[in-house]
C-alpha cells in the first residue's frame, strides 16, 4: 500500500491503490546538498548524476572509521524520497548531487557557500530547465549564507531547505532563515509537528510550510534493494523539493514567487496542532501541510496571496517593524498586531522604489509585528493614500479616488500613545466600497491598485464587545488581500490574516471592562482577478 | 569600480611603511562588519569568508586576497587563501588568526567578514 | 554511446569455473550496478545477481549463492561473473546488463559446460 | 518455474492489437512501480520495450504500451508489423532481487 506520507500530499484525484501522479517533474534538474550518495541504489539508479563537487571538513575523533553506508545513509535516502522509484515524490526528476556534509552529516557554512556557487557556475555553463536546489542542512544564522541563496533565487534557482531539527525558531538558523528559500517544517502521520527525541522541527515565521517528516520510508545504503524509515525536517524538505519538481515540470515559467504562492495555496490548512508550539509563535508559525495541487495546470486564474510576518520590533518607545514581499509580489495591504496590545498601528511606505509595511511600538509595549499580504498580481499598479488625521467627530477617511484603481487593504497609524483614551465615534457612516474608515486621531492609509480585471469588495463581521477575536472570511473564489480592525482601540492587539480569514484580535472585556459601546468589526477585502480567470478560460 | 591603489603591486605594499595609512581604510568611510556564529560550539575560528561590495570584479576580488596576505606577512602573520568567490558572491575564503580581522575589516572593497561555522544534517 | 561488450565464449568442463567480462563505456559508471542475466538454450532468462560499480556490494539470487562471485575493476571500467563448480546445467548465454533497470545489454557470452 | 506468469505464446494479424499479460503477487508486480518489458529476436540480446510500467524508451515505437493493475501487469502492441514478431518478456523487482515471466512467444500471422 502507498506510504502514508506519499497519500498525505496526494489529491484525492489521484488516490488509487498507488501513487503515480501525472507528471513525474522530468523537466526538472534538482541539485541535492548533502553527504555522499549511492547512486546506483535499485531506487534511484540512473537518476542521480554524482558530481565530481566535494567539500568536506574532516570526521571529529580519532578513532571514526568511515562506513561507506554510514557515510551516504542521509543523502541515499534523501535522493529516494524526492525522486525514487518506488517511494519518491518527483519519480521523473533527474537529480545532481553534491557532497557538503562528511560522514557525520556535518558540513561548513564556506563549503555550502562553495557548492552554491558551483550550482550557479554550471548553471551558466549550461542552461537547463528549471533548477531546484535542497538544502537539508541547518547551521546557525549566517549572513553570508543567506545572501548566497538570495542570489542563487535571484538567478531563477528554487531553493528549499530544512526549518532545523532545533525545536526552536527557525529564524535562528541558516539557510532556514533567508527569505527567498522555501523553508520546510516537518509534520507525522497525525499532522502534528514532529518531535525528535529532547527537540524537534523549528517553527516560527520563517518556515514557510510544513510536510511530512516522520517514519519516511526511502532508500537506505546498507544495500542496493534495502529501504529504512527516517525523520527529521530534511524529509520534509525533500517532500517539497519533489512537489516544487512537479510544478515546474508542469509549469517550467513559473517563477518562485508563484511557486511559493502555490505551495502555499495548495496545502492543506489548519491541521496542524499548534499546542506543540510554544504560544508566542504559534500566530507566527503557517498551519500548512504540502500537498500536489489537485491538477497540474490551471491555477494561473487565481489571485494568490500570503501573509508574511515581519520580525519583533523589540519594546523600545520608538522601535518599529517592517514586513516586505518579495520582489515579484504586491504588497496589497498592511496591518499589524502586539500581544499588549500597545502599539501606534502601521503604515505602508516605499523603501529602495518598493512598498513596504512598517508596524509601530507605542510607549510601554513590548513590541509590535509588521503583518504585510503579499499577492501576485500581474501588471498591477499600486499606490498609497493617506489622509492625515481628521479630529473631527466623524473619523478619518480616505479612498481611491484614481479611475480604475480598487481598495486592497487598509492601515492605520496614530501618534497618540493611547487610542482608548480617545473615544472613538460611535457611529460609523458607511461610505463607498473603495474608502478607509479610521479613527479620527489616525492617519489613514488605504491601498488602491489598478490590475486587468481586478475587482474588490468589502466584508464586515462585527460584535458588541470584544471576546478575544473576531473573523470574517472571504468566500469561494475570492481572495483575501485586506485585514483590518476597527475601531483601532486600546483593547485591539491587531489584525492580520490566516489564508482567506481576517482575523482581529482583542484583549477580553472581562480584563479591559470595556464597554459594549467598543464594538469590535473584522474588516476583510475580498478581490478577485476576472482578467486572470479570462485568460484561463482562454488557455484550457 | 577601481579603487585608486587597486595596480599597486604586492611588492609594493610590501614596502609600505607599517603605518599603511588612509590606502587601507575603505572607501566612502563606511566601516565594515564582522560577524560569527551566535552557537559557540558551532563556531570555526581560523577560518573567514570576506565579502566584497556587490560590483566587486573577480581581479580585484584576488588583489584584495593577496593585499592582505601581503599586509599580515609584514605584520609575521601566515594566511592562505582557500578560495576565491565570484559568480554569486564577490569575496574570498582565508585560513588566517583571528589578530588579523582588525585589518582585513579595514581592505578596500569590503563589505563584511563571517566566521566560518558548522552546518549539520537535518 | 552506451555500450556493454563481453567477452568470448567459453567451453568448458563439469566442477570448472569461467569468469565472464563485462566493460562498460559511454555513461557515468557509478551511477549503475551491473546485473548478470543468464538464458539456457530455448528456455527464458534467469536473474543471478548485480553488483555496485560504485562500491562494489553485491547481491545474488539464492539460486547461485555461494558459486558466484562479482568483482569489478574500475580502472578499466570492467566487470567480471564467475562461476564455479559448472554443471551441464549452466550451459546458457550469459548477459551483462546495465543495472536493475536492465536498459543496456551486452551482446552476450555462451558458456558450454560438457564432459 | 519463473515467478511471473505469462501466456506461452499470442498471435495476431498485421494491424490487430495484442495484450500480453504478467501475473505476479503483491510482493513483485503488485508491490512495486518497477515492471519492465523486453523483446528478444532469436540470437540477439533482449532489448528494453517498457520500464517502470508504462514508460517506454526513446526509440521504442508507440505502438508499444504498458500498464498495470493489481498484481497484473500488461504489454499492449497496437497497429501490429512482422517485426513484432519474437519473444516477450515481464520482469519485476521484488524486495531483494529480480524475477522474470516465462516469456511469451509472438507470432504475426
Known amino acids: 500500500s502507498i506510504p502514508w506520507n506519499l497519500e498525505r500530499i496526494t489529491p484525492p484525484r489521484y488516490r488509487a491503490d498507488e501513487y503515480q501522479p501525472p507528471d513525474g517533474g522530468s523537466l526538472v534538474e534538482v541539485y541535492l546538498l548533502d553527504t555522499s550518495i549511492q547512486s546506483d541504489h535499485r531506487e534511484i539508479e540512473g537518476r542521480v548524476m554524482v558530481t565530481d563537487f566535494e567539500n568536506v571538513p574532516e570526521e571529529d575523533g580519532t578513532r571514526f572509521h568511515r562506513q561507506a553506508s554510514k557515510c551516504d545513509s542521509h543523502g541515499t535516502h534523501l535522493a529516494g524520497v524526492v525522486s525514487g522509484r518506488d517511494a519518491g515524490v518527483a519519480k521523473g526528476a533527474s537529480m545532481r548531487s553534491l557532497r557538503v556534509l562528511n560522514c557525520q552529516g556535518k558540513g561548513t557554512v564556506s563549503g555550502t557557500l562553495i557548492g552554491l556557487e558551483f550550482i550557479r557556475k554550471s548553471q551558466l555553463v549550461q542552461p537547463v530547465g528549471p533548477l531546484v536546489v535542497l538544502l537539508p542542512l541547518a547551521g546557525g544564522y549566517s549572513r553570508v549564507l543567506n545572501a548566497a541563496c538570495q542570489r542563487l533565487a535571484r538567478a531563477g534557482v528554487v531553493l528549499v531547505t530544512a526549518a532545523g531539527n532545533f525545536r526552536d525558531d527557525a529564524c535562528l538558523y541558516s539557510p532556514a532563515s533567508a527569505p527567498e528559500v522555501i523553508t520546510v517544517g516537518a509534520t507525522n502521520a497525525q499532522d502534528q509537528p514532529v518531535t525528535l527525541g529532547t527537540l524537534g522541527t523549528n517553527f516560527g515565521r520563517c518556515v514557510d510550510l510544513f510536510a511530512p517528516g516522520e517514519d519516511i520510508i526511502g532508500a537506505s545504503s546498507d544495500c542496493s534493494t534495502c529501504f529504512v524509515s527516517q525523520s527529521g525536517t530534511s524529509q520534509a524538505a525533500a517532500h517539497v523539493a519533489g512537489i516544487a519538481a512537479m510544478m515546474l515540470s508542469a509549469e517550467p515559467e513559473l517563477t518562485l514567487a508563484e511557486l511559493r504562492q502555490r505551495l502555499i495555496h495548495f496545502s492543506a490548512k489548519d491541521v496542524i496542532n499548534e499546542a506543540w508550539f510554544p504560544e508566542d509563535q504559534r500566530v507566527l508559525t503557517p498551519n500548512l501541510v504540502a500537498a500536489l495541487p489537485p491538477s497540474t495546470h490551471g491555477a494561473g486564474w487565481q489571485l494568490f496571496c500570503r501573509t508574511v510576518w515581519s520580525a519583533h520590533s523589540g519594546p523600545t518607545r520608538m522601535a518599529t517593524a517592517i514586513a516586505r514581499c518579495a520582489p515579484d509580489e504586491e504588497l496589497l495591504s498592511c496591518s499589524s498586531f502586539s500581544r499588549s496590545g500597545k502599539r501606534r498601528g502601521e503604515r505602508m511606505e516605499a523603501q529602495g522604489g518598493k512598498l513596504v509595511c512598517r508596524a509601530h511600538n507605542a510607549f510601554g509595549g513590548e513590541g509590535v509585528y509588521a503583518i504585510a499580504r503579499c499577492c501576485l498580481l500581474p501588471q498591477a499598479n499600486c499606490s498609497v493614500h493617506t489622509a492625515p488625521p481628521a479630529e473631527a467627530s466623524m473619523g478619518t477617511r480616505v479612498h481611491c479616488h484614481q479611475q480604475g484603481h480598487v481598495l486592497t487593504g487598509c492601515s492605520s497609524h496614530w501618534e497618540v500613545e493611547d487610542l482608548g483614551t480617545h473615544k472613538p465615534p460611535v457611529l460609523r457612516p458607511r461610505g463607498q466600497p473603495n474608502q478607509c474608515v479610521g479613527h479620527r486621531e489616525a492617519s489613514i492609509h488605504a491601498s488602491c491598485c489598478h490590475a486587468p480585471g481586478l475587482e474588490c469588495k468589502v466584508k464586515e463581521h462585527g460584535i458588541p464587545a470584544p471576546q478575544g477575536q473576531v473573523t470574517v472570511a472571504c468566500e469561494e473564489g475570492w481572495t483575501l488581500t485586506g485585514c483590518s480592525a476597527l475601531p483601532g482601540t486600546s483593547h485591539v492587539l491587531g489584525a492580520y490574516a490566516v489564508d482567506n480569514t481576517c482575523v482581529v484580535r482583542s484583549r477580553d472585556v472581562s480584563t479591559t471592562g470595556s464597554t459594549s459601546e467598543e464594538a469590535v468589526t473584522a474588516v476583510a477585502i475580498c478581490c478577485r482577478s476576472r482578467h486572470l480567470a479570462q485568460a484561463s478560460q482562454e488557455l484550457q | 569600480q577601481e579603487d585608486e591603489d587597486g595596480d599597486y603591486e604586492e611588492l609594493v605594499l610590501a614596502l609600505r611603511s607599517e603605518e599603511d595609512g588612509l590606502a587601507e581604510a575603505p572607501e566612502h568611510g563606511t566601516t565594515a562588519t564582522f560577524h560569527r556564529c551566535a552557537k559557540d560550539p558551532w563556531r570555526l575560528p581560523g577560518t573567514y569568508v570576506v565579502v566584497l561590495k556587490e560590483e566587486t570584479h573577480l581581479s580585484q576580488s584576488e588583489r584584495t586576497a593577496r593585499r592582505l596576505q601581503a599586509q599580515a606577512a609584514r605584520r609575521g602573520y601566515l594566511t592562505k587563501i582557500l578560495h576565491v568567490f565570484h559568480g554569486l558572491l564577490p569575496g574570498f575564503l582565508v585560513k588566517m588568526s583571528g589578530d588579523l580581522l582588525e585589518l582585513a575589516l579595514k581592505l578596500p572593497h569590503v563589505d563584511y567578514i563571517e566566521e566560518d561555522s558548522s552546518v549539520f544534517a537535518q | 554511446q552506451v555500450q556493454l561488450v563481453q567477452s568470448g565464449a567459453e567451453v568448458k568442463r563439469p566442477g570448472a569455473s569461467v569468469k565472464v567480462s563485462c566493460k562498460a563505456s559511454?555513461?557515468?559508471?557509478?551511477?549503475?550496478?551491473i546485473s548478470w542475466v543468464r538464458q539456457a538454450p530455448g528456455q527464458g532468462l534467469e536473474w543471478m545477481g548485480w553488483?555496485?560499480?560504485?562500491?562494489?556490494?553485491?547481491n545474488y539470487a539464492q539460486k547461485v549463492q555461494g558459486r558466484v562471485t562479482m568483482t569489478t575493476d574500475t580502472s578499466t571500467s570492467t566487470v567480471y561473473m564467475e562461476l564455479r563448480s559448472l554443471s551441464s546445467d549452466d550451459t546458457a548465454v550469459y548477459y551483462c546488463?546495465?543495472?536493475?533497470?536492465?536498459?543496456?545489454w551486452g551482446q552476450g557470452t555462451t558458456v558450454t559446460v560438457s564432459s | 518455474q519463473s515467478a511471473l506468469t505469462q501466456p506461452a505464446s499470442v498471435s495476431g494479424s498485421p494491424g490487430q492489437s495484442i495484450t500480453i499479460s504478467c501475473t505476479g503477487t503483491s510482493s513483485d508486480v503488485g508491490g512495486y512501480n518497477s515492471v519492465s518489458w523486453y523483446q528478444q529476436h532469436p540470437g540477439k540480446p533482449p532489448k528494453l520495450m517498457i520500464y517502470e510500467v508504462s514508460n517506454r524508451p526513446s526509440g521504442v515505437s508507440i505502438r508499444f504500451s504498458g500498464s498495470k493493475s493489481g498484481n497484473t501487469a500488461s504489454l499492449t502492441i497496437s497497429g501490429l508489423q512482422a517485426e513484432d514478431e519474437a519473444d516477450y518478456f515481464c520482469?519485476?523487482?521484488?524486495?531483494?532481487?529480480?524475477?522474470f515471466g516465462g516469456g511469451t512467444k509472438l507470432t504475426v500471422l
Open positions: 520482469s519485476s523487482y521484488t524486495s531483494t532481487s529480480m524475477v
Open positions: 546488463a546495465r543495472g536493475y533497470g536492465m536498459d543496456v
Open positions: 559511454g555513461y557515468t559508471l557509478t551511477s549503475y550496478g
Open positions: 553488483i555496485s560499480v560504485y562500491n562494489g556490494n553485491t
